[in-house]
């Protein structure tokens, strides 16, 4: 319960707070748990204790281990443990999961990404931000105090964001980086009873005998990502796969997202070498989700040959 996981990169500053809290007037002693050796308080040391804070300036891989802090008051002692892991810097851009701080979610209305642990450090602006290792540029990104604000958040803004800042200790500067994932939630997302955009109800589609014909069933199901939604064609109330006519097949078309944000699906019915008997069938475009089902019926009619005589 009173143990805290902390991590950092070699040659960067790392400051760890004792998991046990106390008044500023209480003294805090720090020990390296494996050896029970006291951590010095003199600032000339690379690793030193400063009240509730344990400072690695800079950190080294060999510093990894469990550190004990004891908060001493006139009436009681409280013990906490800091499990510190220092990792070697990665040569590539990829930030491994064990270096990631907690994921934050944002939306169109709220897109703040706070720089993790920055409140422990003596830092001055500017705070630099990177997404998937690329420096953020453009007016949509604003580094504001200890957080990043993204204007007009889109789904594509999801990813791993790294903040980089300088910690100053007695005139010496140390670099610090911290990374967290950002996910985008669509606050306006909703699902609704399916709406079929095409074909129109009871539409008559003209086809030419012997030619190929395509019918598109297009329906919308709501705004944002839609789950458990489907569009399909039926022939005389039977699924295409069960109807048993190899000339007639359906395939998923494009799934569209219109400017109003509606999520829509297409199913294209392909009829090869249209025959007379195809004109007798009833073609049903079905759109269904857990709100219900909507059906539009189409019939085929023979296209009259155009008279080209002058």
């Amino acid at each position: 319960k009173f143990s805290k996981q902390s991590w950092g990169l070699e040659n960067e500053a790392l400051i760890v707070r004792c998991p046990r809290q106390g008044k500023p007037s209480y003294t805090v002693d720090w020990y390296y748990s494996q050896t029970n050796k006291s951590i010095p308080t003199q600032e000339r040391n690379r690793v030193f204790a400063s009240g509730q804070l344990l400072k690695f300036l800079p950190a080294a891989v060999a510093d990894s281990g469990i550190y004990t802090c004891i908060v001493r008051s006139p009436t009681f002692n409280r013990t906490g443990y800091a499990n510190v892991t220092i990792y070697k810097k990665q040569s590539d851009c990829n930030v491994p999961d064990y270096l990631m701080y907690s994921t934050v979610s944002g939306s169109e209305k709220n897109s703040k990404i706070y720089c993790p642990t920055i409140d422990l450090y003596n830092w001055t602006a500017p705070l630099e931000w990177f997404k998937n290792c690329q420096a953020l540029q453009g007016s949509r990104y604003r580094a504001h105090k200890s957080f990043l604000v993204i204007d007009n958040v889109m789904t594509e803004d999801a990813g791993d964001y790294t903040c980089k800042f300088i910690h100053n200790e007695n005139g010496a500067n140390y670099s610090v980086t911290a990374t967290r994932s950002f996910t985008v939630k669509d606050e306006q997302g909703f699902s609704l009873f399916p709406v079929i955009g095409a074909p129109a109800q009871n539409e008559i589609k003209e086809v030419e005998i012997g030619k190929n014909a395509n019918l598109t069933c297009s329906a919308c199901f709501g705004k944002g990502t839609q789950f458990l939604a489907a569009v399909l064609w039926q022939l005389n109330g039977t699924k295409i796969t069960d109807f048993g006519e190899p000339r007639i097949q359906q395939e998923e078309g494009q799934n569209q997202s219109f400017s109003n944000g509606l999520a829509c699906l297409d199913m294209v019915l392909r009829i090869a070498d249209v025959k007379e008997e195809d004109l007798l069938l009833q073609y049903d475009c079905l759109a269904l989700n857990l709100h219900g089902l909507r059906r539009h019926t189409v019939r085929l009619s023979r296209k009259n040959p155009i008279d080209h005589h002058s």
Epitope: L228, A229, A230, K239, E252, L290, G292, L293
Partner: nanobody
Amino acid sequence: EVQLVESGGGLVQPGGSLRLSCAASGRTSNIYAMGWFRQAPGKEREPVASITPGGRFPAYADSVKGRFTISADNSKNTAYLQMNSLKPEDTAVYYCSTLYYSGLDPVDYWGQGTLVTVSS
């Protein structure tokens, strides 16, 4: 009318991978979409991914995009969820669900769930 059985859950370290399976039996010809949902302790059930039989346009929750992949083997009436780069916040009971239609109103069927724990 449809029974769903999930498998493949377990304990995995952060950054690890798991593959969940959902086997459907019964009137499977009336299944028009299959999906995965999850419920973390103390939270509401949330959608993760879903897929239609054609499989060309799977749908994913933003939180799993790029890490999870849903697929289906129609011949085996089975849906899969390949989960990579798992994070502690992916810890939840994962449920398989179907969109079922037999001529009446569409309904959803659910499995019993499989527990996924991401922890070091």
